[in-house]
Interface confidence: medium
Amino acid sequence: ARNGDRCPLGPGRCCRLHTVHASLEDLGWADWVLSPREVQVTMCIGACPSQFREANMHAQIKMNLHRLKPDTVPAPCCVPASYNPMVLIQKTDTGVSLQTYDDLLAKDCHCV
Amino acid sequence: ARNGDRCPLGPGRCCRLHTVHASLEDLGWADWVLSPREVQVTMCIGACPSQFREANMHAQIKMNLHRLKPDTVPAPCCVPASYNPMVLIQKTDTGVSLQTYDDLLAKDCHCV
């Protein structure tokens, strides 16, 4: 693994992909989604220590300024770098439809 | 303003563009950047309450799951939606170079 992928806080503590099981009720979708009834939501969770999975120059700057001015500038944040598509079967006024969402499930993560 | 742009926490408390003045020394660049000597770093800072500047479906899901499982799922995070370019004049092994960075200064912000 690159240096930027080794978590200095211990295994699993830094920014990475997590899976959270959620029902349609959990997601607030019960009224308009028919299927699936449960979703394995992949999302980005974890700390962003210095040099860990820095997305770009902006993330580097943010970390440097956070160290200097922690009360003003927050640390970089763990967010999706890309997404996996997901199809939902939805209720519509006329019946049902299949809708592909390209921005629903995180595929991989980085720090911004 | 759209509902998603009205901050329920009070003016300026939610995710928005902030400007932070930083010297090359602050950024750790003094040895390899010639010019400019200071940068007005634009970055995204602020809270992401429900429905505020949600970037996509993933952000909606994250907020819903955060309310259900706050210890497991963090709230959405304020990050750049796009960037402004910036030129740095840099020292190189062979002399100097002009480098345009497309991912250095945040242009606008959203919650992911």
Epitope: - | L34, S35, P36, R37, E38, Q40, V87
Partner: antibody, heavy 119, light 107 residues
Framework: EVQLQQSGPELVKPGASMKISCKAS????????MNWVKQSQGKNLEWIGL????????IYNQKFKGKATLTVDKSSTTAYMELLSLTSEDSAVYYC????????????WGQGTSVTVSS | DIQMTQSPASLSVSVGETVTITCRAS??????LAWYQQKQGKSPQLLVS???NLADGVPSRFSGSGSGTQYSLKIISLQSVDFGSYYC?????????FGGGTKLEIK
């Protein structure tokens, strides 16, 4: 008070070289870049290049590479520009100008040094 | 190199009038532009940086505007001390070229 004091006017022969000085005072010399600008016939302004006194780095307008050499002496807070192999085309007023820290404009200028190249 | 085209080249106006000087860049310079004033026999003086930021001590009758490739310097209610030459300069990639200048003369 920020001041940039340049050396006096020069009359030099074609083919000769010469060095213009720019003594900086009233601010932290290494904290600001120094630029050099040429003005011909009281009109056209041309950027020659800059030097970063903190790390010694220089960048030149390609047009002046080999014509101008920029240096600094941190101990005396003085910037120098050496002009090489002078021709009549080099007759002009030359300015040193401090670069603002934030961004790249030039906020303080020397009084200018008039250089006349003539045999 | 980026070319800076300044217009007009000269302008004859009366005290109290409003003038606008424009500068067009040959490509997008992302507001990395300064304006200078130069009096006869004197060094240039910074008026505006980053396209719109008035330099310290510059009267509020001066204002800079623009984006992309088009920029302007506006002087309202011209005073006798405002007469002289004005130059724009870009800072987007080197060389940092200047416009050809605008000479502002008293009518």
């Amino acid at each position: 008070e920020v001041q940039l004091q340049q050396s006096g006017p020069e009359l030099v022969k074609p083919g000769a070289s010469m060095k213009i000085s720019c003594k900086a005072s009233g601010y932290s010399f290494t904290g600001y870049n120094m630029n050099w600008v040429k003005q011909s016939q009281g009109k056209n302004l041309e950027w020659i290049g800059l030097i970063n006194p903190y790390n010694g780095g220089t960048i030149y307008n390609q047009k002046f590479k080999g014509k101008a050499t920029l240096t600094v002496d941190k101990s005396s807070t003085t910037a120098y520009m050496e002009l090489l192999s002078l021709t009549s085309e080099d007759s002009a007023v030359y300015y040193c100008a401090r670069e603002v820290r934030l961004g790249n404009a030039m906020d303080y200028w020397g009084q200018g040094t008039s250089v006349t190249v003539s045999s | 190199d980026i070319q800076m085209t300044q217009s007009p080249a000269s302008l004859s106006v009366s005290v109290g009038e409003t003038v606008t000087i424009t500068c067009r860049a040959s490509e997008n310079i992302y507001s990395n532009l300064a304006w200078y004033q130069q009096k006869q026999g004197k060094s240039p003086q910074l008026l505006v940086s980053a396209a719109t930021n008035l330099a310290d001590g510059v009267p509020s009758r001066f204002s800079g505007s623009g984006s992309g490739t088009q920029y302007s310097l506006k002087i309202i209610s011209l005073q006798s001390v405002d007469f002289g030459s004005y130059y724009c300069q870009h800072f987007w990639g080197t060389p940092w070229t200047f416009g050809g200048g605008t000479k502002l003369e008293i009518k």
